[in-house]
């Protein structure tokens, strides 16, 4: 995804306006409460974000740097130590990261609970995935909406995709795509993949030609995750655009329906941004409608959406959700995942552009090792005395978290917490732990990437029809 | 289409009670923020009192502070006005209104045809 | 005596331009939307101008509003006898608490 500035407070507060707008006009309008609630929380979000970086409350009509009467009638807004996440940047101060449950309430999601996870269990007739067990995929849109669908023998489809902004993919882009895989493999449902060239295009400084040999590149580390060729179709943007007219016409159908002061609101676009830039979130959402894939579901509009993603990615997911009802089309629903640490600590997002910050898909056995030992952030003690006797952190420490994302089994990850919280287990045996589970699993991938041809690639990459079932 | 009708509103002595009623119905009561604002006979308007979409924020103008609570049964699409102690001067036409905007700022794009509270002895 | 001042009345002819002002504070009109109100003889006040300048669907363009620093006005261009009527500026006030509105101008199409 690319990387910008968190807007500046004039930004800010012209967002909270033209977002207040939009509140306005859904209600004018009598839309459902469903869209009232979550524009609300958009904007409650916003405004949010306003107090912590103006250090007072949000003013209507009084614009940073006017001067204030200091009371305001409006909601009280929390403390200003607010997480800041957009599609570019993730931020907290905290180092457990970033709180997810505030972040549900600010995004106006819904909770993944337990009568959640069961309803899927029982729907698939498979045992959750860990990624659900363990709150990693923790907020959705929708989900019972495509459970009611599959329980009913309706269709619905995957979506997800890939900002390919380098050759090199660290072990946090797969977590949607391991994700995906499973939910491909329990539903046996089709599934499209959008590499977003475009976007990186749009975003850095890349030719054309490297941002869509990047895409191939990437293409080739997500087909290495085991997707069923018969059932998935990967795509860049530059060059499905311009062969599929019912894509191409599904994005100028949301770019006429999505108001630039929208835009700006959600992405925090400002007059100095491209066009292109403006435009971009019109194709990210196209997808998310089934005629935009004319060789897999013909003209059928009606065909539900399911998008499994990073928490961050919400705001563009917002603005389709926002704009299917305007257009005819159903409103995608969406599996949202927590960010991956960086190697450094939970305060941000790994960086593909910092070689320390992560584990790379190319990294050798022993760069892993070395990356671990040196750079993981560790919960653990000063001294192996007090350690031993106060035991390590694992809300904190990396080498735990990345566990649990990686150690598939259950009792192990419990015993090693149990271990590393009592002091038992010191930070040196918990990286070994790590490094144990990381090295093969990286070295897999790598073996699974060799066998990915260019015929593969152009295979997966070939607008055709999927095999499934749907009535 | 988007109703508000008020009810409740007659004749009582200074130092009575009544209970003015709002029923909404065409759109999602719930989600929207609700005044009363009253007129008196051939006067302007005098907003009195505000709830939040979930009852949870309150305002009420001074000069019914203490003798009015406004309240809301989102079940019923039903907005209250509880009037206590009422004075000659409470004597108007009350209208419940609806606010679009999304933080109390008096943005009432509906408003009912109003109920004429009069108070004498 | 109301938080926000307008003149109590107005006229004009059909055609003209009329102008109606509301004066307020800093902590009404200075930090906070203004909306505008018309009220026709018999019934319910109806929304005119929402935040300071906007028209609401299905207000004729001949209606405009305005806002600088503690003052507000209401433009109404190409006068017609079905705009006679009372017209009421508002706006929170944040000292207060509490939404206020201007005593009302009576606007006649003379």
């Known amino acids: 995804m690319p990387n910008s500035e968190p807007a500046s407070l004039l930004e800010l507060f012209n967002s909270i306006a033209t977002q207040g707008e939009l509140v306005r006009s859904l209600k004018a309008g009598n839309a459902s409460k469903d869209e009232i609630d979550s524009a609300v929380k958009m904007l409650v979000s916003l405004k949010m974000s306003y107090k912590a970086a103006a250090g007072e409350d949000y003013k209507a009509d009084c614009p940073p740097g006017n001067p204030a009467p200091t009371s305001n009638h409006g909601p009280d807004a929390t403390e200003a130590e607010e997480d800041f996440v957009d599609p570019w940047t993730v931020q907290t101060s905290s180092a457990k990261g970033i709180d997810y449950d505030k972040l549900i309430v600010r995004f106006g999601s819904s909770k993944i609970d337990k009568e959640l996870i069961n309803r899927i269990e029982r729907a698939t007739g498979q045992r959750p995935h860990h990624f659900l067990r363990r709150g990693i995929f923790f907020s959705h849109r929708d989900m019972n909406q495509v459970l009611d669908a599959y329980e009913n023998k309706k269709p619905f489809y995957l979506y997800t995709g890939r900002g390919p902004s380098s050759e090199a993919m660290h072990v946090g882009h797969l977590i949607p795509f391991i994700f995906t895989k499973w939910l491909q493999d329990v539903f046996n449902v089709p599934l499209v993949i959008q590499m977003t060239d475009d976007e990186k295009y749009l975003w850095k400084d890349l030719t054309l030609d490297q941002a869509y040999s990047y895409a191939v590149e990437n293409a080739k580390d997500i087909i290495a995750c085991g997707f069923d060729i018969n059932k998935t179709f990967i795509f860049s943007d530059l060059d499905y655009m311009g062969m599929s007219s019912g894509f191409y016409k599904n994005v100028v159908k949301i770019q006429k329906h999505v108001t630039f002061n929208q835009v700006k609101g959600i992405f925090g676009f400002t007059d100095s941004d491209c066009i292109g830039k403006i435009s971009f979130p019109a194709i990210q959402a196209a997808p998310s409608f089934s005629n935009s894939f004319p060789q897999i579901f013909r003209d059928r509009t009606d065909i539900q959406c399911l998008i499994p993603c990073a928490i961050d990615q919400d705001p563009y997911f917002r603005m389709t959700r926002d704009v299917a009802p305007r257009i005819g089309y159903p409103k995608p629903a969406l599996l949202h995942s927590t960010f991956f640490p960086a190697l450094q600590g939970a305060q941000t997002k790994m960086s593909a552009s910092d070689p320390n910050s992560s584990i790379f898909l190319t990294d050798t056995a022993k760069q892993i090792k070395t990356k671990v030992n040196k750079h993981a952030f560790s919960g653990g003690r000063d001294t192996i005395e007090e350690h031993r006797q106060f035991g390590g952190n694992c809300d904190v420490d990396v080498s735990f978290m990345y566990l649990t994302f990686f150690l598939e089994d259950d009792d192990k990850l419990e015993q090693i917490r149990k271990d590393y919280t009592s002091g038992a287990m010191l930070t040196g045996e918990l990286k070994k732990a790590l490094i144990e589970v990381l090295q093969p699993l990286i070295a897999e991938h790598q073996a699974r990437r060799k066998e990915v041809t260019d015929e593969i690639v152009k295979e997966f990459m070939t607008p055709r029809k999927l095999s499934f079932d749907f009535q | 289409e988007v109703q508000l009708l008020e009810s409740g509103g007659g004749l009582v002595q200074p130092g009575g009670s009544l209970r003015l009623s709002c029923a909404a119905s065409?759109?999602?009561?719930?989600?929207?923020?609700m005044s009363w604002v009253r007129q008196a006979p051939g006067k302007g308007l005098e907003w009195v009192s505000a709830?939040?979409?979930?009852?949870?924020?309150?305002y009420y103008a001074d000069s019914v502070k203490g003798r009015f609570t406004i309240s809301r049964d989102n079940s019923k699409n039903t907005l209250y006005l509880q009037m206590n102690s009422l004075r000659a001067e409470d004597t108007a036409v009350y209208y419940c209104a609806r606010d679009v905007a999304w933080d109390m700022l008096g943005d009432f794009d509906y408003w009912g045809q109003g109920t004429l509270v009069t108070v004498s002895s | 005596q109301s938080v926000l001042t307008q003149p109590p009345s107005a006229s004009g002819t059909p055609g003209q331009r009329v102008t109606i002002s509301c004066t307020g504070s800093s902590s009404n009109i200075g930090s906070n939307y203004v909306y505008w109100y018309q009220q026709l003889p018999g019934t319910a006040p109806k929304l005119l101008i929402y935040a300071n300048s906007k028209r609401p669907s299905g207000v004729p363009d001949r209606f405009s509003g305005s806002k600088s620093g503690t003052s507000a006005s209401l433009a109404i261009s190409g006068l017609r006898s079905e705009d006679e009527a009372d017209y009421y500026c508002g706006a929170w006030d944040d000292s207060l608490s509490a939404y206020v509105f201007g005593g009302g101008t009576k606007l006649t199409v003379l």
């Open positions: 065409g759109f999602t009561f719930s989600s929207y923020d």
């Open positions: 709830i939040s979409s979930g009852g949870s924020s309150i």
